[in-house]
Every structure is written in structure tokens, then in C-alpha cells.
């Protein structure tokens, strides 16, 4: 299931890059799969929000919880906030299977 998520993520990133006109030399943060969830490409100064992966949101449909953010800075992506373990209750797929 997670290999499938990763493959879908890479497809999404490719499509987003085309839509946004992103390439390897573009300023900003490239889209990425961080082994837990998918992050779309972003411009410097942009904050991106993602929900905890669906698998772990079954018991937590709350809009206010289970959300992780990263800032796109001149140095690249910031660390996720909150950390996955605190926001979602887990921090690695491998360990959950």
C-alpha cells in the first residue's frame, strides 16, 4: 500500500511541476515523498499543510487535528510541525505494517 502511495505521489509531483513551471533550477522547494506523505512543490515563503495519511485518520476525522505543515524557506523545506509522531501518532510506515 505504501509503495503505491509513493508512486502516486511522484506522479502528483510531476503534474504539479508542469502546472507550476517548476524545474530543477527553479527557486523554491521541490515536491517530495518523505516516506510518510506527499508534499507538493512550493514557492519560498509558502506554508504547505497535509493531513495525516488516511490510514491513520479513520478514527480521527477532526479538521482541527492530524494536520502537519512545512514551510518552504530559501534553505529548502523546514521540519514538519508538529512532528508526525505528535500529530498522527506514528512516525514511520515500516513500523506500522
Amino acid at each position: 500500500i505504501f509503495k503505491k502511495e509513493q508512486a502516486m505521489c511522484l506522479e502528483k509531483i510531476q503534474r504539479a511541476n508542469e502546472l507550476m513551471g517548476f524545474n530543477d533550477s527553479s527557486p523554491g522547494c521541490p515536491g517530495m515523498w518523505d516516506n510518510i506523505t506527499c508534499w507538493k512543490p512550493a514557492h519560498v515563503g509558502e506554508m504547505v499543510l497535509v493531513s495525516c495519511p488516511e490510514l491513520f485518520r479513520i478514527f480521527n476525522p477532526d479538521q482541527d487535528m492530524g494536520v502537519v505543515s512545512r514551510n518552504c524557506t530559501e534553505d529548502g523545506w523546514s521540519e514538519p510541525f508538529p512532528h508526525y509522531f505528535d500529530a498522527c501518532g506514528f512516525d514511520e510506515y515500516e513500523s506500522e505494517t
Epitope: 510541525f81 505528535d86 513500523s95
Partner: antibody
């Protein structure tokens, strides 16, 4: 029913190592849904979360920055217990120390606690 | 670290009263907020998690509310066994930090 039983010395000399153990009954230290935490409480600092260990296919630890250079939390799967070691203690480390189980349901919370151990750091 | 403050620091009340304790976080913490009760010489006891979820076995006279930075713990019809100290704790960011406590004593 989950119970946590703490043991360890109540008096430690400055610069030495504080060592406490928390024995788990009614659960396992290897439970993939739980975390195993140490917290302390003193009049000057209130309740202070020190860190945790947990198993998710491999053992992991999270420590509070305030004690990160001095703390070790180790699981002992053979005895289903976990321990706290705090090195280079000073009188500031005098507190009641608690172990507690962490569980997840929308957020992490501490649902079962040990009885507490008053540790005094004094020569 | 996220700072947690509580008010009042202490309050006097009578059996049957409805009381409210406030907890404030130094930054937004969504609903990653837990409440504990502690009696002298005992370990804290979990009351409420995720700001408003009542822990199993806790009487329904306890309730929690709030989101973001401001939270409240309400006890409806205070019982003799409710005289204790109450702590809030955030769990959105390590180190998890606690409020200084609110002591509820008998008027």
C-alpha cells in the same frame, strides 16, 4: 489492569547517576501502541516531561532538550520494564519521579502512572 | 518550548458548585490538550484528552472545551472527591509541557 511499579533509591549524591526502574504489569513494554515515559515533579519546576521509549519494529527514544545530554531511557523486554538513568545530578534534580504509559487517541496522553519516587540529591 | 499557563492558581468552592479552570498555551496547539487531576501524595490521573474527550471511567460532570490557545475544564456539581489540583498539558510539540496547576479547595 495496567499497573506500573517503580523502584530505585531515594537518595543520590551530587554528580552521581540517578537510576529508577518501572515494572509493567497488564501490558508489555513492546506494545506497538504505547509509549513509556518518565516525568518528574518539584515545587520549583512543576511537572516536567523528561522523555520516553517505544517500540515500533525497532526501539526509539525521545528526550526533553533540558536533560538530553544526561538522560537514558532503556527498555528491558525480558522483564517487561523500563528504566531511567540521569547522569551528573545536582540538587536541582531533586523531585518526585513518575513513570507513565502513553497512549494515542487523537493525541498522546498519559493514562497510567507509577506511584512516584521521591529522589533527593544531597551529599 | 510551549508555555502553558492556568488560571486561577487556586480557588475555593463548595460541594455542588460549578467551577471552570482556564488553560492557555503560548502558541496554537489545535486540540492537543490533556487534563489531569492530582491529589496530595498521589500520581496525576487522566481526565480528558484531545481537549474534550472524557477518559473512560471519569464521571460526566467533568468536561473540557477549547481549541487553539484557550481551553477550559469545567466541573459541574463539584463532589467531595473533586477537591484536588488540576493540570493541563500540551502534546503537540516535544517537550510536552504542563501548566502550573489549579488547586481547588473547600470553601
Amino acid at each position: 489492569q495496567v499497573q506500573l511499579q517503580q523502584s530505585g533509591p531515594g537518595l543520590v549524591k551530587p554528580s552521581q547517576t540517578l537510576s529508577l526502574t518501572c515494572a509493567i504489569s497488564g501490558d508489555s513494554v513492546s506494545n506497538k501502541q504505547a509509549t513509556w515515559n518518565w516525568i518528574r515533579q518539584s515545587p520549583s519546576r512543576g511537572l516536567e516531561w523528561l522523555g520516553r521509549t517505544y517500540y515500533r519494529g525497532k526501539w526509539k527514544n525521545h528526550y526533553a532538550v533540558s536533560v538530553k545530554s544526561r538522560i537514558t531511557i532503556n527498555p528491558d523486554t525480558s522483564k517487561s520494564q523500563f528504566s531511567l538513568q540521569l547522569n551528573s545530578v545536582t540538587p536541582e534534580d531533586t523531585a518526585v519521579y513518575y513513570c507513565a504509559r502513553g497512549m494515542w487517541n487523537q493525541n498522546w496522553f498519559l493514562d497510567h502512572w507509577g506511584q512516584g519516587t521521591l529522589v533527593t540529591v544531597s551529599s | 518550548d510551549i508555555q502553558m499557563t492556568q488560571s486561577p492558581s487556586s480557588l475555593s468552592a463548595s460541594v455542588g458548585d460549578r467551577i471552570t479552570i482556564t488553560c492557555r498555551a503560548s502558541q496554537k496547539i489545535a486540540r492537543y490538550l490533556v487534563w489531569y487531576q492530582q491529589k496530595p501524595g498521589k500520581a496525576p490521573k487522566l481526565l480528558i484528552y484531545a481537549a474534550n474527550m472524557l477518559q473512560s471511567g471519569i464521571p460526566s460532570r467533568f468536561s473540557g472545551s477549547g481549541s487553539g490557545t484557550d481551553f477550559t475544564l469545567t466541573i459541574n456539581s463539584l463532589q467531595p472527591e473533586d477537591f484536588a489540583t488540576y493540570f493541563c498539558q500540551q502534546s503537540i510539540q516535544q517537550p510536552y509541557t504542563f501548566g502550573p496547576g489549579t488547586k481547588v479547595d473547600i470553601k
